[in-house]
Amino acid sequence: SSPGKPPRLVGGPMDASVEEEGVRRALDFAVGEYNKASNDMYHSRALQVVRARKQIVAGVNYFLDVELGRTTCTKTQPNLDNCPFHDQPHLKRKAFCSFQIYAVPWQGTMTLSKSTCQDA
């Protein structure tokens, strides 16, 4: 029989560094899900992470407040990581999103639990 999951005392969310590998992976995942769900032909990427928090439960909940910007790259293009942001006023678009990502890192899994975005 495999070891079960013991009950755990859950602490509240704590501030996390954007330099943390876990935060970076959660951000990439959330932005990827945002782009999959959006009907925009252009790819968006993070302009800045306004706040990052994490809460360790049975896995890890990441709470990310992110400002997203629309890039000049269409979603079909390869290598979207360094696409420049649109600077033409009629194409420029920003969104402010709050993402909650649930990760079980030792299982290699991530789920977008909550996502709320509004135009900035």
């Epitope: 943390e20 299982q107 290699g108």
Partner: antibody, heavy 117, light 111 residues
């Protein structure tokens, strides 16, 4: 009973390649992440990397990143570790280990990889 | 240099109680991740001894116990027996490295 059987180890020259296999039985292989952990002779344990249940996600230790690839075939209940550009410091016993709970809970008996000219 | 720090050796006589410490940092144990302990008998593969800080898998005697506080954890072995002579390793997930990290191992000698 969970069983993990590693194979594919042996003597390889520096710069060479090797593919290790881990045959799993006694649990639902396709439901869980799998890991490779190594142990150099007379040294401690070092995690090499993991692969998610569906094979879509892999994480690697910095020491092997770019030189190793973990894959799995759920239809064959088998885990793989492809190692390239091997160095003397890769000499170790390589273990596969399951994560059916919250840790590395079951381990194979290991296979020895020796990198030497 | 291991990410988690353990004493290289520990010893005790039969019947005694020994403890082995494991010290981490704010990116692993201190972040709130569980600590797990492994026993490696000479010439064999590691075996899970304690998971989730304090829990024993079935078949592990209650002479083995674990605890965790802050950035450290401990493994205690009471009623020491000759068959406990082995290497003991602690492990935890690490946020910065995004992988499992281990202590350097503690060689337990039963005198």
């Amino acid at each position: 009973e969970v069983q993990l059987l590693e194979s594919g180890g042996g003597l390889v020259q520096p710069g060479g390649s090797l593919r290790l296999s881990c045959a799993a039985s006694g649990f639902t292989f396709s439901s869980y992440a799998m890991n490779w952990v190594r142990q150099a002779p007379g040294k401690g344990l070092e995690w090499v990397g993991l692969i998610s249940y569906d094979g879509r996600t892999t994480y690697y230790a910095d020491s092997v990143k770019g030189r190793s690839t973990i894959s799995r075939d759920n239809s064959k209940n088998t885990l793989y570790l492809q190692m390239n550009s091997l160095r003397a410091e890769d000499t170790a016993v390589y273990y596969c280990a399951t994560t059916t709970g919250t840790t590395l809970d079951y381990w194979g008996q290991g296979t020895l990889v020796t990198v030497s000219s | 240099q291991s990410v988690l720090t353990q004493p290289p050796s520990a010893s005790g006589t039969p019947g005694q109680r020994v403890t082995i410490s494991c010290t981490g940092s704010s990116s692993n144990i201190g972040a709130g991740y569980d600590v797990h302990w492994y026993q490696q008998l000479p010439g064999t593969a590691p075996k899970l001894l304690i998971y989730g800080n304090t829990n024993r898998p079935s078949g592990v005697p209650d002479r083995f116990s674990g605890s965790k506080s802050g950035t450290s954890a401990s493994l205690a072995i009471s009623g020491l027996r000759s068959e406990d002579e082995a290497d003991y390793y602690c492990a935890a997930w690490d946020d910065s490295l995004y992988g499992w990290v281990f202590g350097g191992g503690t060689k337990l000698t039963v005198l």
